[in-house]
């Protein structure tokens, strides 16, 4: 039976009809009392006092309502949940993930996990209603957990008309290769000992380091991974592992040449709730590699939205060459990652200036052959974008990737809903399209426009009458991603390039074929 529920937009927790709850008001000491009425949360401020007993984990501040028994935790940065039990910065799980308390919420199939408090799970052996739920990491959230000591974190997903458990695609902290680091590498305990410039690291117990804070003599040295070795470490929460080096007889430090363990192409997909012409409104967490590129124009004040882009490494964005025909100076460009609404700043967005951009030398502005460009983000260190649930790289395809004809893939962007619309979309959209066979991706299928071997076609193959809402890219989506699932990860197959109109039956969109440019990409991204 259909149940009316409320979703608290601030915390993403769900509540049944007439259920009440407390929530802290961000960036203030106020607390609100909310209750679920016909699918809408109604909230007002209530007086609170300090809790009579500690109930919050991880340094959370407990407050309880003055006139009834509920309590609320004000969580320190990096923690969330009713009792601050959720570690929002955990990027991977250790061992079997029994102690994993991160926010990954996507199953291996790509399905979105179900909230553990959902009434649909009430009869399941593991749900947020269990008396020991908090101890097991279960609660009013849909994050992957391993409450039954299985081999890795899992969750319940709704498929084939029922709820069943499925393993999650949460990254493991040591995917058989501990000589790479996750997140900022604070937990890195590998044996790399060279810096990015090729210099050898000094041992952490070297006499030269006397007076430095981070040495083998530090009281927390063991916990920080420092000792009688010269392996790269990140004891101070810097951007990535580093070490002390001697450069021209001068003591300094440098970031290390340790590869980051790839979490490319992993995402926390949520089923879009709203259909819109040409596709579906989406959240950035479902497409965390999507970038928005803005440009300052010489003639008009302010910035205007230019094109989409694709995050392929911490400091590099792929886009379409035709977006840069105006030859903007790099400092007139801005790249924004982690944004759901095109012109509304996101809470976790990251904004960058552009160091330089490289347009393919053989880009043809008549045919759009070689429609590819690379933008290097500006940063003070060797890292630019910081990985989070809303910012993550897409995987580049292997050179020999050949997906079957009609494989279902997806594209995303902030482009127009339809060709004749005067406006770009206010919110990120996604569209589901299928890869056309090369025999259906020719000039004769595209009004005699030139189609080269550097292009591929994809479109919505559903049969539809004149009112059908066929998915497609449109103006403003250019430079954005066409991604397909490969080996459990979303892999970049195409760059949105051109098309005839938008969403027309039997007229595919045309994309830059990324496998043809892997060497070009690698070559231009060299340090």
């Amino acid at each position: 039976s259909y149940q009316v529920i409320c979703r608290d937009e601030k915390t993403q927790m769900i509540y049944q009809q007439h259920q009440s709850w407390l929530r802290p008001v961000l960036r203030s000491n106020r607390v609100e009392y909310c209750w679920c009425n016909s699918g809408r949360a109604q909230c007002h401020s209530v007086p609170v006092k300090s809790c009579s007993e500690p109930r919050c984990f991880n340094g959370g501040t407990c407050q309880q309502a003055l006139y009834f028994s509920d309590f609320v935790c004000q969580c320190p940065e990096g923690f969330a949940g009713k009792c601050c039990e959720i570690d929002t910065r955990a990027t991977c799980y250790e061992d079997q993930g029994i102690s994993y308390r991160g926010t990954w919420s996507t199953a291996e199939s790509g399905a979105e996990c179900t909230n553990w408090n959902s009434s649909a799970l009430a009869q399941k052996p593991y749900s947020g209603r269990r008396p020991d739920a908090i101890r097991l990491g279960l609660g009013n959230h849909n994050y992957c957990r391993n409450p039954d000591r299985d081999s890795k974190p899992w969750c319940y997903v709704f498929k084939a008309g029922k709820y069943s458990s499925e393993f999650c695609s949460t990254p493991a902290c040591s995917e058989g290769n501990s000589d790479c680091y996750f997140g900022n590498g604070s937990a890195y305990r590998g044996t790399h000992s060279l810096t990015e410039s090729g210099a050898s690291c000094l041992p952490w117990n070297s006499m030269i380091l006397i007076g430095k804070v981070y040495t083998a003599q530090n009281p927390s040295a063991q916990a920080l991974g420092l000792g009688k070795h010269n392996y790269c470490r990140n004891p101070d929460g810097d951007a990535k592992p580093w070490c002390h080096v001697l450069k021209n007889r001068r003591l300094t430090w440098e970031y290390c040449d340790v590869p980051s363990c790839s979490t490319c192409g992993l995402r926390q997909y949520s089923q879009p709730q709203f259909r819109i012409k040409g596709g579906l409104f989406a959240d950035i967490a479902s497409h965390p590699w999507q970038a928005a590129i803005f440009a300052k124009h010489r003639r008009s004040p302010g910035e205007r939205f230019l094109c989409g882009g694709i995050l392929i490494s911490s400091c590099w964005i792929l886009s379409a060459a035709h977006c840069f025909q105006e030859r903007f100076p790099p400092h007139h460009l801005t790249v924004i990652l982690g944004r759901t609404y095109r012109v509304v700043p996101g809470e976790e967005e990251q904004k960058f200036e552009v160091e330089k951009y490289i347009v393919h030398k053989e880009f043809d502005d008549d045919t759009y052959d070689n429609d590819i460009a690379l933008l290097q983000l500006k940063s003070d260190s060797s890292r630019c974008a910081q990985e989070s649930s809303v910012v993550r790289t897409v995987c580049l395809p292997p050179a020999d990737l050949q997906l079957p004809d009609w494989t279902e893939c997806e594209l995303s962007g902030y482009g127009k809903h339809e060709a004749l619309s005067p406006f770009y979309s206010e919110r990120l959209k996604e569209a589901h399209v299928r890869l056309y066979p090369s025999s259906r991706c020719t000039s004769q299928h595209l009004l005699n426009r030139t189609v080269t071997d550097n292009m591929l076609c994809a479109g919505d193959t559903r049969s539809g009458g004149p009112q059908a809402n066929l998915h497609d890219a449109c103006q403003g989506d250019s430079g954005g991603p066409l991604v397909c699932l490969n080996d459990g990860r979303m892999t970049l197959v195409g760059i949105i390039s051109w098309g005839l109109g938008c969403g027309q039956k039997d007229v595919p969109g045309v994309y830059t074929k990324v496998t043809n440019y892997l060497d070009w990409i690698r070559d231009n991204m060299r340090p």
Epitope: D179, H192, G198, D257, V258, P259, K356, I358, K361, L374, Q376, L396, P397, P398, A399, D400, T515, L518, D519, R522, D523, N524, M525, R526, P527
Partner: antibody, heavy 114, light 112 residues
Framework: QVQLVQSGAEVKKPGASVKVSCKAS??????INWVRQATGQGLEWMGR????????YYAQKFQGRVTMTRNTSISTAYMELSSLRSEDTAVYYC?????????WGQGTLVTVSS | DVVMTQSPLSLPVTPGEPASISCRSS???????????LDWYLQKPGQSPQLLIY???NRASGVPDRFSGSGSGTDFTLKISRVEAEDVGVYYC?????????FGGGTKVEIK
């Protein structure tokens, strides 16, 4: 520290093929280049492979005769040269490229002789 | 293809004296990403080549500071401020800016 260890010397007949391997340890995400050197001659760049995606670039001179592959699970790159002739007698080196070819294998001598 | 021309072909040196090797490219070797991938390698007798200088003027790890590189566009120079006996071997310049990548013909440095 990246270390590259190459397979042993080979003797081949003209027209045959040779496959040289290069096992990498350390950071194996960089291009692997193949460079050859005939006795008493200079260094000649043959091409490169990206161990991650497997994309390749071959120098025109070797196009059609050389194939560079990799097996990521064992961190090994391979260079196969076919239709061998006597002038292919040389030491073949693999070299890992990040900002330059900072790490080199010990070389594999391939002798082509009837 | 970019042709790299080195001079001299052979360089007899006296230990303690300076030495200089020139390398000229047939066209500019500034890469489209703005970098100039001009490297110098030394191949000592019976050994694999080793990196000395990368991107024109950056000394590789462990390379003594008597080695320095300079130049731009098409003209590049490797200097050894005071040659030591262990510096003998063949020096190669190399461009990695335009494919196919190419080496210079080499300069043999030997003690007088």
């Amino acid at each position: 520290q990246v270390q590259l260890v190459q397979s042993g010397a080979e003797v081949k007949k003209p027209g045959a093929s040779v496959k040289v391997s290069c096992k990498a340890s350390g950071n194996t995400s960089y291009w692997i280049n193949w460079v050859r050197q005939a006795t008493g001659q200079g260094l000649e760049w043959m091409g490169r492979i990206d161990p991650g995606g497997g994309s390749t670039y071959y120098a025109q001179k070797f196009q059609g005769r050389v194939t560079m592959t990799r097996n990521t699970s064992i961190s090994t790159a391979y260079m196969e040269l076919s239709s061998l002739r006597s002038e292919d007698t040389a030491v073949y080196y693999c070299a890992s490229y990040y900002y330059a070819m900072a790490y080199w294998g010990q070389g594999t001598l391939v002798t082509v002789s009837s | 293809d970019v042709v790299m021309t080195q001079s001299p072909l052979s360089l007899p040196v006296t230990p303690g004296e300076p030495a200089s090797i020139s390398c000229r490219s047939s066209q500019s070797i500034v890469h489209s990403n703005g970098n100039t991938y001009l490297d110098w390698y030394l191949q000592k007798p019976g050994q694999s080549p080793q990196l000395l200088i990368y991107k024109v003027s950056n000394r590789a790890s462990g390379v003594p500071d008597r080695f320095s590189g300079s130049g731009s566009g098409t003209d590049f120079t490797l200097k050894i401020s005071r040659v030591e006996a262990e510096d003998v071997g063949v020096y190669y310049c190399f461009q990695g800016s335009h494919v196919p990548w190419t080496f210079g013909g080499g300069t043999k440095v030997e003690i007088k």
